[in-house]
């Protein structure tokens, strides 16, 4: 990805998805009535013109927000503590890797706008998730809906990272 982002970053992302999957505590079929449109900003991860700074910023903000969401008293009450601790550890490692990368990308002179804009958009998206949880009084189903929503958005963000990685490989081999 044009910086010393460890090869295992993709693996860590997949591990995060696996952990989020394992965290399930209630049959999701019971929770259809709690579905909500959180309006994940798909355009942010679907574009074909991917800048390194943009990808790094999206991933960093995503992971930061997921970390914050699952690092609260409410979250501790809702989830298995062992899995939650593993999730925190994995997210912390990925954030450290990305921070190293972001510093390098900014040092290479990529636009600050490419970094701040996705961060603001994602903050609004996660604020909507927090409001929903509060509205639903942090019910088991509300947490289940949020868990699946986070898995979806993280999956899309990880795909964006893979697309940039393969684009870099293509450029490197030509």
């Amino acid at each position: 990805l044009g910086c010393d982002l460890p090869q295992n970053h993709g693996l860590l992302s997949r591990n995060t998805l696996v952990l989020l999957h394992q965290m399930r505590r209630i049959s999701p079929f019971l929770c259809l009535k709690d579905r909500r449109d959180f309006r994940f900003p798909q355009e942010m991860v679907k574009g074909s013109q991917l800048q390194k700074a943009h990808v790094m910023s999206v991933l960093h903000e995503m992971l930061q927000q997921i970390f914050s969401l699952f690092h609260t008293e409410r979250s501790s009450a809702a989830w298995n503590m062992t899995l939650l601790d593993q999730l925190h550890t994995g997210l912390h490692q990925q954030l450290q890797h990305l921070e190293t990368c972001l510093l390098q990308v900014v040092g290479e002179g990529e636009s600050a706008g490419a970094i701040s804009s996705p961060a603001l958009t994602l903050r609004r998206y996660f604020q909507g998730i927090r409001v929903y949880l509060k509205e639903k009084k942090y019910s088991d189903c509300a947490w289940e809906v949020v868990r699946m929503e986070i898995m979806k958005s993280l999956f899309l963000s990880t795909n964006m990272q893979e697309r940039l990685r393969s684009k870099d490989r293509d450029l490197g081999s030509s």
Epitope: H21, R24, P28, L32, K33, R35, R36, D37, M148
Partner: antibody, heavy 121, light 108 residues
Framework: EVQLVQSGAEVKKPGESLKISCKGS????????IGWVRQMPGKGLEWMGI????????AYSPSFQGQVTISADKSISTAYLQWSSLKASDTAMYYC??????????????WGQGTLVTVSS | DIQMTQSPSSLSASVGDRVTITCRAS???????LNWYQQKPGKAPKLLIY???SLQSGVPSRFSGSGSGTDFTLTISSLQPEDFATYYC?????????FGQGTKVEIK
């Protein structure tokens, strides 16, 4: 391109067992649920049940609970609908369709072509 | 279980007509997760509208959905020859998921 391809038509005798399949491709199979829908000749659509292929958790319509079994093999992106003892009244077209789970996205946006099951002595 | 009742069961209309099909739920679908499908003879159903009013990708804009709570409507603004089919509503609010009995749109 997202596709759900179902197994071919079956002709069976009452009391026989049967397992029909639905193979997903062109998307992440474990990111969506698979639902099964029955349509008896000249009749409407009836929801039978649904499976989350990521861990094979299922939910059934009370009308079909205990009558059929829904399963999945995520390693080959395939969902199944099976009967242990068919009845003449099981004669119908059976459709599989993908469902977004708890995500806010279109329900049953892609459907298989259907499997016609005929049960007759 | 949530019962879905469609009306009318069938209707005859001409090309260019405005057609309205209604679907009533036996209890409130509070998140408006109501879907509409079109089915032609010998074919699998096709999703037209989801979440009461969102048009599925690739579906012509002459199809629209509206309603909330217990009463929902599918409207075809100007009926085309390819629209003669059976239409089903389906609630995605709770399991068991349930379909309406269908409305057959025939040529007058």
């Amino acid at each position: 391109e997202v596709q759900l391809v179902q197994s071919g038509a079956e002709v069976k005798k009452p009391g026989e067992s049967l397992k029909i399949s639905c193979k997903g491709s062109g998307y992440s199979f474990t990111s969506y649920w698979i639902g099964w829908v029955r349509q008896m000749p000249g009749k409407g659509l009836e929801w039978m049940g649904i499976i989350d292929p990521s861990d094979s958790d299922t939910a059934y319509s009370p009308s079909f609970q205990g009558q059929v079994t829904i399963s999945a093999d995520k390693s080959i992106s395939t969902a199944y609908l099976q009967w242990s003892s068919l009845k003449a009244s099981d004669t119908a077209m059976y459709y599989c369709a993908r469902h977004p789970g708890l995500n806010w996205a279109p329900d049953f946006d892609y459907w298989g072509q259907g499997t016609l099951v005929t049960v007759s002595s | 279980d949530i019962q879905m009742t469609q009306s009318p069961s069938s209707l005859s209309a001409s090309v260019g007509d405005r057609v309205t099909i209604t679907c009533r739920a036996s209890q409130s679908i509070r998140n408006n997760y109501l879907n509409w499908y079109q089915q032609k003879p010998g074919k699998a159903p096709k999703l037209l509208i989801y979440a009461a009013s969102s048009l599925q990708s690739g579906v012509p804009s002459r199809f629209s959905g509206s309603g909330s709570g217990t009463d929902f409507t599918l409207t075809i603004s100007s009926l085309q020859p390819e629209d003669f089919a059976t239409y089903y509503c389906q609630q995605g609010y709770d399991t068991p998921l349930t379909f309406g009995q269908g409305t057959k749109v025939e040529i007058k």
